[in-house]
Structures are given as C-alpha cells and as structure tokens.
C-alpha cells in the first residue's frame, strides 16, 4: 500500500488551493501597524491552518497571526517597512504556500469620516468636506480620494470625482432640484506607498432645494 493516505488531512491540504491575499494598515492604532490576510477561496477548511510572517521585522525573526473567523491578522510595531517579508500558510511546522510581499505596496488606508455637505445659497453650490486620520500620520500621508454621489432613487448611477484635497464643490445646476442625494468617499495611497481603496466612509444624505426656493436651507445632518 502507498503511504499517501497515512496522513489524510495533510495530504488533502496539499491538494487544495491555499492562495491568499493581504493588506497592511500603517499606524492604524497609535504607532501600531496591522496586516490582514484571508484565503482567496472562502470555503477552504482553515481548521489547522496558521499564517506566519518572517523577514523585514524589527527585533524578531517571525510573527504569528491571530485568527478571527476566516480572517488572519497581526497588530504590531515591528514591521520594518523596508524590503520584502515572507508570509506563509502553515500546518504545524510545514509551510503549504508562501508569498514575498513588501508591506508598503499593499496598504489599505482607513476610511474617511465626518463627511458633510453644506448648501451655499448665494453661490448656488454645495460644499462637500470630510476628514481623514491620515493627515496626522507619519507614513501614509498623501492620498487620492474618490467622492461618489447619486440621486437616491438611482440605484447604481454613481458619479465619481477624484481629488487630493478633503474639500469639493458641487454646482447646484449639476444636480436635480428637490431631490435626495447620497454621497460617500474612499481613499487610496497616492505617493510612495501603493495599495488598495479604503472602505467607504459612512454615507451622508442631503436634499437639494427647489429651484425657486429663496431660503435654500438644507436639512442638517
């Protein structure tokens, strides 16, 4: 008999696809960074699987990830942020698959917040402002933002505006009168650091005034 089935779990594991994706978030909790990974196949059996990162770390050779449901993550100050780290999926001491990744190229910024819209009656426009925690950060400071807005009744007709500042002006004549709008914003690294879009900010809702409305007041949120 062949020894192929002697360690069924491990042999089965070797037949599976353990490809995974990760993103980093720098200074996400004070000076702590985080790294989050997940298997690309959400149905993979993760019971005995662990993640480990080695290399490009400060003071230690390797670090183990914590597990939350199907997510693996680390929060640490020990990322060197220079050079590539080796991230491996392991069963016990055996590595099933590894990836060499520069953590500065897989950065996902934190979501913008405090999004608001103020109507200026005299100027016939709407001033959109929002905040980002990255203005206070040491590393990922420069971002490109994607502001998306739609008339609430138009399920998937989003208009997108890209900008590098945290302020945008929308002209009243470009919007429908007496209509409800939803607006949201997300961010992506735009200088030195590379990576992915942040989560969307919470949506903000505003109503445009009637064309002949002299007060022009918006419902405050």
């Amino acid at each position: 008999e062949s020894g192929y089935a002697q360690n069924g779990d491990l042999e089965d594991a070797e037949l599976d696809d353990y490809s995974f994706s990760c993103y980093s978030q720098l200074e996400v909790n004070g000076s702590q960074h985080s790294l989050t990974c997940a298997f690309e196949d959400p149905d993979v059996n993760i019971t005995n699987l662990e993640f480990e990162i080695c290399g490009a770390l400060v003071e230690v050779k390797c670090l183990n990830f914590r597990k939350l449901q199907e997510i693996y993550f680390i929060e640490t100050k020990k990322f060197l942020l220079i050079g590539k780290s080796n991230i491996c999926v392991k069963v016990g001491e055996k590595s099933l698959t590894c990836k060499k990744i520069d953590l500065t190229t897989i950065v996902k910024p934190e979501a913008p917040f405090d999004l608001s819209v103020v109507y200026r009656e005299g100027a016939n426009d709407f001033v959109v402002t929002f905040n980002t925690s990255h203005l206070q950060k040491k590393y990922v400071k420069v971002l490109m933002h994607d502001v998306a807005y739609r008339q609430e009744k138009d399920e998937n007709k989003w208009t997108h505006v890209n900008l590098s500042s945290t302020k945008l002006t929308l002209l009243q004549r470009k919007l429908q009168p007496a209509a409800m709008y939803e607006i949201k914003v997300r961010s992506i690294p735009d200088h030195y650091f590379k990576g992915f879009w942040s989560e969307w900010s919470p949506s903000y809702y505003f109503r445009t005034p009637e064309i002949n409305n002299s007060s022009g007041e918006m419902d405050p949120i």
Epitope: I71, A111, E199
Partner: nanobody
Framework: QVQLVESGGGSVQPGGSLRLSCATS????????MTWYRQGPGKTRELVAV???????TYADSVKGRFTISRDNAKNTMDLQMNGLKPEDTAVYYC???WGGGLNRAPFDYWGQGTQVTVSS
C-alpha cells in the same frame, strides 16, 4: 441574498432605554463595517453610530454618551443600546453592513428594513 433584520424598536418615555439588534440570515464577512442610521419624520437619513471589525466606534454628536454600539463577530450581530432617549430620537432606525471589496471578496452593501423608535410622554 443576505438579509438584515432589525428588532427592539418600540415606544418609550423620555429618559427611557431601548436596545436595538441587527441580525443577518447569511454569513457576513468578518471585516464588514456595521452602521446604524436613522430617519426622523420629514428629515433626511442620518448616521447614528459605526463599528468596524476591529471594534473602533464612531458616534453622531447628538447621541454621544447616550448610545453604545457593539457587535458579535461570531454571531454576525450588531446592537445599539440607547439610553436617555429624547423626543428628537424618534425615527426609523436602519442597520447597514458594508464591505468595500478586497481579499478576493466582492463588495457588498446590505440594508435592513428598519425598526420604529418613538420617544414620547
């Protein structure tokens, strides 16, 4: 299709408390951001509270110190404990679960049907 179901709404006197819950019928990805919004009579929908997968919370100024948002990732549920309720808290409360995409998971944006909260003496 994932469904979100809110519960816990009702009528209460000023100063009273209610606890809203939001449960999902399907498996919600752990990294999703969970949010409570509300819409009062004749008003636009507004943010009440947000909780990220990491447990970071954000509140609207009008509810700070009175409302507490929490979540249970193992059960895919979110709660909103509302204390010191005021008449101006009267609204339909909606839960929202969002994931912007990444890690080979498609983006999603799910909304509940809403639960009515009425604060009146």
């Amino acid at each position: 299709q994932v469904q979100l179901v809110e519960s816990g709404g009702g009528s209460v006197q000023p100063g009273g408390s209610l606890r809203l819950s939001c449960a999902t019928s399907g498996s919600i990805f752990s990294l999703a951001t969970m949010t409570w919004y509300r819409q009062g009579p004749g008003k636009t929908r507004e943010l009440v509270a947000v909780i990220t997968w990491r447990g970071t919370t954000t509140y609207a100024d009008s509810v700070k110190g009175r409302f507490t948002i929490s979540r249970d990732n193992a059960k895919n549920t979110m709660d909103l404990q509302m204390n010191g309720l005021k008449p101006e808290d009267t609204a339909v409360y909606y839960c929202n679960v969002k994931w912007g995409g990444g890690l080979n998971r498609a983006p999603f944006d799910y909304w509940g049907q809403g639960t009515q909260v009425t604060v009146s003496s």
